[in-house]
Interface confidence: low
């Protein structure tokens, strides 16, 4: 990794042991100021591998609400608007970081957690296994 | 929202003001033990809207490495393996939370940051604007 010189104005950290505990400011800085949030909002319907979005809520997690994509079809939508089962709709997954309250129900103490979410679906050529 | 009774064993928080500062344990708990990491690894190549993955590294961010998807084509791959420009390859984007070192170069002090990443691509029917 890259070695970064320590800033002398850093808050003092007394816990030098792992698991490492750090201070996190929850006042979110949003870097997405130039993006239009509605830009990809209709892709789930217009895609040849359309998907539905399911709300996953967990008050012990931050963010508490995560939207999960579920592909609508096994196949993909063809030019005629029918499902073509020679192709497959598959979920595109991504590992994301969330904060989990630890100990439970604590407002100011969290642990980083990695979870896998399905963001949307894409249409792929199936893997065909030929039997000898 | 859901009201959660406070756990009496929570660490004491002296800073009651916003921006809210919390303690976060960076020893990541991975909830993805049941998933096969190779499961969706080749979708970027098999998709009708294939994409390339670009490495985005920032030592002041946690995680420091994020992979960004860039669609290979403007159109989508048809059954003959050619690009069909009557359809569009578009990125599926997701807002994710990352930790930004703040003040810069501090190992134990972060701020939550929301960034938009492209996770993969999907093939969509274009929106056709009819000119009167």
């Amino acid at each position: 990794g890259i070695t970064i010189p320590r800033n002398p104005g850093c808050p003092n950290s007394e816990d030098k042991n792992f698991p490492r505990t750090v201070m996190v400011n929850l006042n979110i800085h949003n870097r997405n100021t130039n993006t239009n949030p509605k830009r990809s909002s209709d892709y789930y319907n217009r895609s040849t591998s359309p998907w539905n979005l399911h709300r996953n809520e967990d008050p012990e997690r931050y963010p508490s609400v995560i939207w999960e994509a579920k592909c609508r079809h096994l196949g993909c939508i063809n030019a005629d608007g029918n499902v073509d089962y020679h192709m497959n709709s598959v979920p595109i997954q991504q590992e994301i970081l969330v904060l989990r309250r630890e100990p439970p129900h604590c407002p100011n103490s969290f642990r980083l957690e990695k979870i896998l979410v399905s963001v949307g679906c894409t249409c792929v050529t199936p893997i065909v296994h030929h039997v000898a | 929202g859901i009201t959660i009774p406070r756990n009496p064993g929570c660490p004491n928080s002296e800073d009651k003001n916003f921006p809210r500062t919390v303690m976060v344990n960076l020893n990541i708990h991975n909830r993805n033990t049941n998933t096969n990491p190779k499961r969706s690894s080749d979708y970027y190549n098999r998709s009708t809207s294939p994409w390339n993955l670009h490495r985005n590294e920032d030592p002041e961010r946690y995680p420091s490495v994020i992979w960004e998807a860039k669609c290979r084509h403007l159109g989508c791959i048809n059954a003959d393996g050619n690009v069909d420009y009557h359809m569009n390859s578009v990125p599926i984007q997701q807002e994710i939370l990352v930790l930004r070192r703040e003040p810069p170069h501090c190992p134990n002090s972060f701020r939550l940051e929301k960034i938009l990443v492209s996770v993969g691509c999907t093939c969509v029917t274009p929106i056709v604007h009819h000119v009167a």
Epitope: N56, C71, V90, S118, P126 | -
Partner: nanobody, 123 residues
Framework: QVQLVESGGGLVQAGGSLRLSCAAS????????MGWFRQAPGKEREFVAA????????KYADSVKGRFTMSRDNAKKQVYLEMNSLKPEDTAVYYC????????????????WGQGTQVTVSS
Amino acid sequence: QVQLVESGGGLVQAGGSLRLSCAASGLTASSYAMGWFRQAPGKEREFVAAISWISGGTKYADSVKGRFTMSRDNAKKQVYLEMNSLKPEDTAVYYCNDMPYGLDTRMDEYAYWGQGTQVTVSS
């Protein structure tokens, strides 16, 4: 680690009935549905039925519609397959599995299968 234990199979005469059970443990919080699949000797594994944990909605293969009924018990994390009017062509090893992406999840998405339970229908 997901663990799937199927039971309830056996030998039955054509026209008879059987009830299969599947106990699932280690499912992720995002588990969406459960499915029954079967594999007859010399044939590929095929979809039989599926049920949503959330809504209880079901889906069946055309070959079993009207004869098989799938149900669930969320508290026990168990699913069942009630098989009536059995035919010799229903003879197969029956497997259950998690369907994390809905009732249309493809079988090649699965990393793990249980031992299955043998169903034999004699004529």
